[in-house]
């Protein structure tokens, strides 16, 4: 069964800078990746980025840079809002559309007691949806 993993990482050099890493574990080719926060895409979440393997990437504030890390994983850097701990306790969701499997989505957040530079390990998928 395909699986999606999500890691949220606070950068050691900039305490106000966060990076979301997402990956797809499974066969098939990825046609689109959507990253949202505050909930799943289309279910109360706000879109942060869309990444297409050929047509490029699209990002919305406060996303700073969305990019492919491998053919099946992406990263999204977020800029500080000026608020204290701006992205703590915030849920980030990644949705991978792949062929022929369909769409798979998982969500994660920064662990409550994260040290700078550490990230959440790839956890069991809390939200897993095949469309």
């Amino acid at each position: 069964t395909p699986e999606v993993w999500v890691q949220v990482q606070m950068e050691a050099t900039e305490l106000s800078s966060f990076t979301v890493h997402c990956g797809f574990l499974g066969p098939g080719s990825i046609s689109l990746v959507t990253v949202s926060w505050g909930g799943p895409d289309g279910a109360g979440g706000t879109k942060l980025a869309v990444l297409h393997p050929e047509l490029g990437t699209r990002q919305w504030a406060p996303a700073r840079q969305a990019r492919w890390e491998t053919q099946s994983s992406i990263s999204l850097a977020l800029e500080d809002s000026g608020a204290s701990s701006p992205f703590a306790n915030t849920t980030f969701c990644c949705k991978f559309a792949s062929f022929p499997e369909g769409s798979w989505e998982s969500c994660g957040s920064l662990p409550p007691s994260s040290d700078p530079g550490l990230s959440a390990p790839p956890t069991p998928v809390p939200i897993l949806r095949a469309d």
């Epitope: 289309g42 109360g44 706000t46 297409h52 504030a61 406060p62």
Partner: antibody, heavy 123, light 111 residues
Framework: EVQLQQSGAELAKPGASVKLSCTVS????????IHWVKQRPEQGLEWIGG????????VSASKFQDKATITADTSSSTAYMQLSSLTSGDTAVYYC????????????????WGQGTSVTVSS | DIVLTQSPASLAVSLGQRATISCRAS??????????MHWYQQKPGQPPKLLIY???NLESGVPARFSGSGSGTDFTLNIHPVEEEDAATYYC?????????FGGGTKLEIK
């Protein structure tokens, strides 16, 4: 200079369809979303939907999903919206608008608007 | 859908005074310090014009007498000092989730 030029006024009969156009200049249509907004006479604004011309993704409000079809032709820098099965409730001014973009980041707000296309549905 | 309620529906303000327009959302439109609320001005026969984006950011070319504030569910647009050319209808719009919705509008008259 950023501009969105919309097609002219339409007079249509109930049950008919119309296709509105929005031709952009002063920026690359692939760099941002183009949205469509409805404004009935003396009333407020309603978001219909939008399109990402680079990727071809469309998003729309559920109440307009069977009413409006949004497309784009990047070669002519034009976005289109087709309204089908017209009724008197579709009589309105329809605006296209560009989503605000800066340094490759979008902001979910609409910073440049077309002049509007008036659609009148009458038998 | 998130409902935006603007108040007052209309107001009359003397030249040079402050105009305050409120917008209340039926649920929070903020996440971690980011507020997905925007303000527009519309004059008769013209399309809307973006004034403020993300609650408090002044759009390029908009006079500094316009300012936005708020977070969560309560937002405010302030105009001070009000000028004759500010007579218009003002709309708030959220983009916290799909579909984005607009407030009902506030008509500002200059006395």
């Amino acid at each position: 200079e950023v501009q969105l030029q919309q097609s002219g006024a339409e007079l249509a009969k109930p049950g008919a369809s119309v296709k509105l156009s929005c031709t952009v200049s002063g920026f690359n249509i692939k760099d941002t979303y183009i949205h469509w907004v409805k404004q009935r006479p003396e009333q407020g604004l309603e978001w219909i939907g939008g399109i990402d011309p680079a990727i071809g993704n469309t998003v729309s409000a559920s109440k307009f999903q069977d009413k409006a079809t949004i497309t784009a032709d990047t070669s002519s820098s034009t976005a289109y919206m087709q309204l089908s099965s017209l009724t008197s409730g579709d009589t309105a001014v329809y605006y296209c608008a560009r989503e605000r973009v800066h340094s490759n980041t979008l902001y979910y707000a609409m910073d440049y608007w077309g002049q509007g296309t008036s659609v009148t549905v009458s038998s | 859908d998130i409902v935006l309620t603007q108040s007052p529906a209309s107001l009359a303000v003397s030249l040079g005074q402050r105009a305050t327009i409120s917008c209340r959302a039926s649920k929070s439109v903020s996440i971690s310090g980011y507020s997905y609320m925007h303000w527009y001005q519309q004059k008769p026969g013209q399309p809307p014009k973006l004034l403020i984006y993300l609650a408090s950011n002044l759009e390029s070319g908009v006079p500094a007498r316009f300012s936005g504030s708020g977070s969560g569910t309560d937002f405010t647009l302030n105009i001070h000092p009000v000028e004759e050319e500010d007579a218009a209808t003002y709309y708030c719009q959220h983009s916290r989730e799909l579909p984005p919705t607009f407030g009902g509008g506030t008509k500002l008259e200059i006395k």
